[in-house]
């Protein structure tokens, strides 16, 4: 099949980095500046991706491969091939339509991206809270009360109160 194709289609001989130029008797012409062809036998070269604005160039475009972008500091990539950049937040926050907002009481986020997640409910596993949760950290569950030796006690979680540093609404 390949041999037949070669006999019928001179373009199949054009390597990556070139295109089969119909205007020049189907000879193989190099891709023009700012374009590329990643496979052989192409009749056109593709325009290189430009990493503009918050996108930074991670890999320059070449005649045989597209440019690759990542995001400027303070942002992270989303989507296939870093098609979008999304703003980072601080730990203990999540990104909303209104910008970065602190996690609500009872939730945490230990990363600069993603959403605030509820603290682990230790009692569901029959365990007690060893270390209280914060906006940035999940609770640490300890042994179940029954596992504790006589006389020992676990740290009891504080009564749900308003979040530290936040005035009542």
């Amino acid at each position: 099949f390949e041999r037949t194709r070669s006999l019928q289609d001179p373009c199949s001989n054009c390597p990556a980095g070139t295109f089969c130029d119909n205007n020049r008797n189907q000879i193989c012409s190099p891709c023009p500046p700012n374009s590329f062809s990643s496979a052989g036998g192409q009749r056109t070269c593709d325009i290189c991706r430009q990493c503009k604005g918050v996108f930074r160039t991670r890999k320059e475009c070449s005649s045989t491969s597209n440019a690759e972008c990542d995001c400027t500091p303070g942002f992270h990539c989303l989507g296939a091939g870093c098609s979008m950049c999304e703003q980072d937040c601080k730990q203990g926050q999540e990104l909303t339509k209104k910008g970065c907002k602190d996690c609500c009481f009872g939730t945490f986020n230990d990363q600069k991206r993603g959403i605030c997640r509820p603290w682990t409910n230790c009692s569901l596993d029959g365990k007690s809270v060893l270390v209280n949760g914060t906006k940035e950290r999940d609770v640490v569950c300890g042994p179940s009360p029954a596992d504790l030796s006589p006389g020992a006690s676990s740290v009891t979680p504080p009564a749900p109160a308003r979040e530290p540093g936040h005035s009542p609404q």
Epitope: G53, L78, S83, C85, E86, Q87
Partner: nanobody
Framework: EVQLVESGGGLVQPGGSLRLSCAAS????????MIWYRQAPGEELEWVAN????????YYVDSVKGRFTISRDNAKNSLYLQMHSLRAEDTAVYYC????????????????WGQGTMVTVSS
């Protein structure tokens, strides 16, 4: 080609006003959230404001609330940022950006950015 082009920046005295514009082309403008960001010299990019597809939802960073107004004209494929009571700390390059598809639901990523327009607030 999908493109965003900002204009309207310049030198203004403290307390003054400016109106930035962002002209969109190459895509259906009315289908997308639009966002203003700014970058002060030596600082990271800072989100300023965003607006949903029909202009019914608008959000601002605390430091510009009551002074800046984001708006859009879908018939003209244009985004605006009206800035009043400007302060020295508003000095920055201002960028408009397009929210990626499904912005506000599954993510807050931007996929298209303009080249920026410089705003300098100085006496």
């Amino acid at each position: 080609e999908v493109q965003l082009v900002e204009s309207g920046g310049g030198l203004v005295q403290p307390g003054g006003s400016l109106r930035l514009s962002c002209a969109a082309s190459g895509f259906t403008f009315s289908n997308y959230w639009m966002i203003w960001y700014r970058q002060a010299p030596g600082e990271e990019l800072e989100w300023v404001a965003n607006i949903n597809q029909d202009g019914s939802e608008k959000y601002y960073v605390d430091s510009v609330k009551g002074r800046f107004t984001i708006s859009r004209d879908n018939a003209k494929n244009s985004l605006y940022l009206q800035m009043h009571s400007l302060r020295a700390e508003d000095t920055a390059v201002y960028y408009c950006a397009r929210g990626g598809e499904d912005y506000g639901n599954s993510h807050y990523g931007m996929d298209v950015w303009g080249q920026g327009t410089m705003v300098t607030v100085s006496s």
